[in-house]
Interface confidence: low
């Protein structure tokens, strides 16, 4: 079967990296460069990505395959393939459409993506807080307070924080 | 001047097929990928199918694939998406689009392309 399709078809020969050339009466010729073709019997090579502006090389283009982006530091992917590139922002903030805004207290973010989530309620687990969270970390819960030993406390819940750079009214 | 224009789209019963034109004018088609995205009510415009210029590497959102089918015919200069097993959420007005020859963007943000059509609207409902 494969050598009758051959006999039909020119083209199926072609390997990945080469393309069936119509101008040279179906000779298979390599891929121009930043071009590529990841199968064989293709009549054209596809242009390479080019990972420009935000975006930098993870993977060269090859005459088989495709460039692979990653983001300029500062920035993550996004997407599939890295299709777009986001401003990373510190521990404790998430990305808003102002910018990077400061975790509102009782939440938090401890990666540099993402957005704030809620800090644990220990309470729900009939337990106590350990830690107290902050805008980059979760609080840590302890043990019950019923399990604790006499004498022993737990850390208090903190009481409603100031938003940074407020002082005292 | 370049110029866009949709056709095909209509209402379909879930489970039925629809089959979009784009006849593109004014420039070299076969130089060019081509893309088509859509957009629902109150929704942003989502792509849904690219394919390169060679008509060799093609790109497909997660929730078409193997169902819609993006194809040109560069000697027509006509795009084509052909859909089957439509679904309710399928509804949208889909757009075709020429990429550009260079963009900072992947293909599957609407920054990489240059120049739309108008839109033709697909209906999918009992």
């Known amino acids: 079967f494969e050598r009758t399709r051959s006999l039909q078809d020119p083209c199926s020969n072609c390997p990945a990296g080469t393309f069936c050339d119509n101008n040279r009466n179906q000779i298979c010729s390599p891929c121009p460069p930043n071009s590529f073709s990841s199968a064989g019997g293709q009549r054209t090579c596809d242009i390479c990505r080019q990972c420009k502006g935000v975006f930098r090389t993870r993977k060269e283009c090859s005459s088989t395959s495709n460039a692979e982006c990653d983001c300029t530091p500062g920035f993550h992917c996004l997407g599939a393939g890295c299709s777009m590139c986001e401003q990373d922002c510190k521990q404790g903030q998430e990305l808003t459409k102002k910018g990077c805004k400061d975790c509102c207290f009782g939440t938090f973010n401890d990666q540099k993506r993402g957005i704030c989530r809620p800090w644990t309620n220990c309470s729900l687990d009939g337990k106590s807080v350990l830690v107290n969270g902050t805008k980059e970390r979760d609080v840590v819960c302890g043990p019950s307070p019923a399990d604790l030993s006499p004498g022993a406390s737990s850390v208090t819940p903190p009481a409603p924080a100031r938003e940074p750079g407020h002082s005292p009214q | 001047e370049v110029q866009l224009l949709e056709s095909g789209g209509g209402e379909v019963q879930p489970g039925g097929s629809l089959r979009l034109s784009c006849a593109a004018s004014?420039?070299?088609?076969?130089?060019?990928?081509m893309a088509w995205f859509r957009q629902a009510p109150g929704k942003e415009r989502e792509f849904v199918s690219r394919?390169?210029?060679?008509?060799?590497?093609?790109d497909y959102v997660e929730s078409v694939k193997g169902r819609f089918t993006i194809s040109r015919d560069n000697a027509k200069n006509t795009l084509y998406l052909q859909m089957s097993s439509l679904r309710a959420e399928d509804t949208a007005v889909y757009y075709c689009a020429r990429q550009r020859s260079y963009s900072r963007y992947d293909i599957r943000t609407p920054q990489t392309y240059d120049y739309w059509g108008q839109g033709t609207l697909v209906t999918v409902k009992p």
């Open positions: 394919l390169a210029w060679s008509g060799g590497s093609t």
């Open positions: 004014g420039w070299a088609f076969g130089n060019y990928g």
